[in-house]
């Protein structure tokens, strides 16, 4: 059957931990992505930012997992109002910020 939302969120958190833990060289060669507002609709916004990073196998699983939280199809070059379009940050920092926010959502029981 379908994975419970709490399990899916926990697995996403653990995948982000693995990414931050296994950083030998700069994540995705130091690629920059648009920062996002960590609010409602955040999963789609995060996916929209990360999907523009190509050729980075380290975040492919994260991209797939985020797509499971986003109700619509996301493609490269697509941007929602949740992006802070004047701020770009490294993928590594993006992942760290997202991880901390997701841990707080998990604590609050916001699994969707």
């Amino acid at each position: 059957g379908p994975v419970p939302p709490s399990t899916a969120l926990r697995e996403l958190i653990e995948e982000l931990v693995n990414i931050t833990q296994n950083q030998k060289a700069p994540l995705c060669n130091g690629s920059m992505v648009w920062s996002i507002n960590l609010t409602a609709g955040m999963y789609c916004a995060a996916l929209e930012s990360l999907i523009n990073v190509s050729g980075c196998s380290a975040i492919e699983k994260t991209q797939r997992m985020l797509s499971g939280f986003c109700p619509h199809k996301v493609s490269a070059g697509q941007f929602s109002s949740l992006h802070v379009r004047d701020t770009k940050i490294e993928v590594a920092q993006f992942v760290k910020d997202l991880l901390l926010h997701l841990k707080k959502l998990f604590r609050e029981g916001q699994f969707n």
Epitope: R10, K103, R107, G109
Partner: antibody, heavy 122, light 108 residues
Framework: QMQLVESGGGVVQPGRSLTLSCAAS????????MHWVRQAPGKGLEWVGV????????HYADSVKGRFTITRDNSKNTLNLQMNSLRVEDTAVYYC???????????????WGQGTMVTVSS | SYILTQPPSVSVAPGQTATITCGGN??????VHWYQQKPGQAPVLVIY???DRPSRIPERFSGSNIGNTATLTISDVEEGDEADYYC???????????FGGGTKLTVL
């Protein structure tokens, strides 16, 4: 100001019972999860248990489960720890501490009492 | 149940930087809190949610949490920082709050 004050500590024989109380003041008690933490002489901190803001849930450390019971009275801003079948290894300073209540009780303890000493000895 | 491992002691000269670690399996997936406890006193929260600092705590205190290790860093250490430091997490699988064994910080 915001305060937690424990009381009820003392010397008790093994196998006997004792009830500790924690009086809260200066904040909205009913909106916080409340924990008990203990510290044996010269040892580290050990979590004892928690009761949710509305009293609907309690969780206990394995070392006290079945012997200790946490209750609260939100109308009187009080927290209680009923300790039964006390053992020598329960000897410790007992602290009450508050933590903002979410779906899960993973918040930090931002306010602690001064502690009350419980000595279990024959 | 979940286990947090801290070094029993850390020594540092005044003005230097103290680093206290807290190890746990995939601790990076958990929110970590840090407490300072001086002799005869109740613990005081110094870092919460991995890296946030209560308003009354000096900026010299900072925290991080990556992979299997959370870290409390105290820069420009002062004699008044000498204390025991404890890390803490909530273990979702057992519904238990867990403390590390504590680290005694000695200022030389």
């Amino acid at each position: 100001q915001m305060q937690l004050v424990e009381s009820g500590g003392g010397v008790v024989q093994p196998g006997r019972s004792l009830t500790l109380s924690c009086a809260a003041s200066g904040f909205e008690f009913r909106t916080y999860g409340m924990h008990w933490v203990r510290q044996a002489p010269g040892k580290g901190l050990e979590w004892v248990g928690v009761i949710w803001d509305d009293g609907s849930n309690t969780h206990y450390a394995d070392s006290v489960k079945g012997r200790f019971t946490i209750t609260r009275d939100n109308s009187k801003n009080t927290l209680n720890l009923q300790m039964n079948s006390l053992r020598v290894e329960d000897t410790a300073v007992y602290y009450c501490a508050r933590a903002p209540q979410w779906y899960l009780t993973a918040e930090a303890f931002d306010l602690w009492g001064q502690g009350t000493m419980v000595t279990v000895s024959s | 149940s979940y286990i947090l491992t801290q070094p029993p002691s850390v020594s540092v000269a005044p003005g230097q930087t103290a680093t206290i670690t807290c190890g746990g399996n995939l601790i990076g997936a958990k929110l970590v809190h840090w407490y300072q406890q001086k002799p005869g006193q109740a613990p005081v929260l110094v870092i919460y949610d991995d890296s946030d600092r209560p308003s009354r705590i000096p900026e010299r205190f900072s925290g991080s949490n990556i992979g299997n290790t959370a870290t409390l860093t105290i820069s420009d250490v002062e004699e008044g920082d000498e204390a025991d430091y404890y890390c803490q997490v909530w273990d979702y699988s057992s519904d238990h709050m867990v403390f590390g064994g504590g680290t005694k910080l000695t200022v030389l």
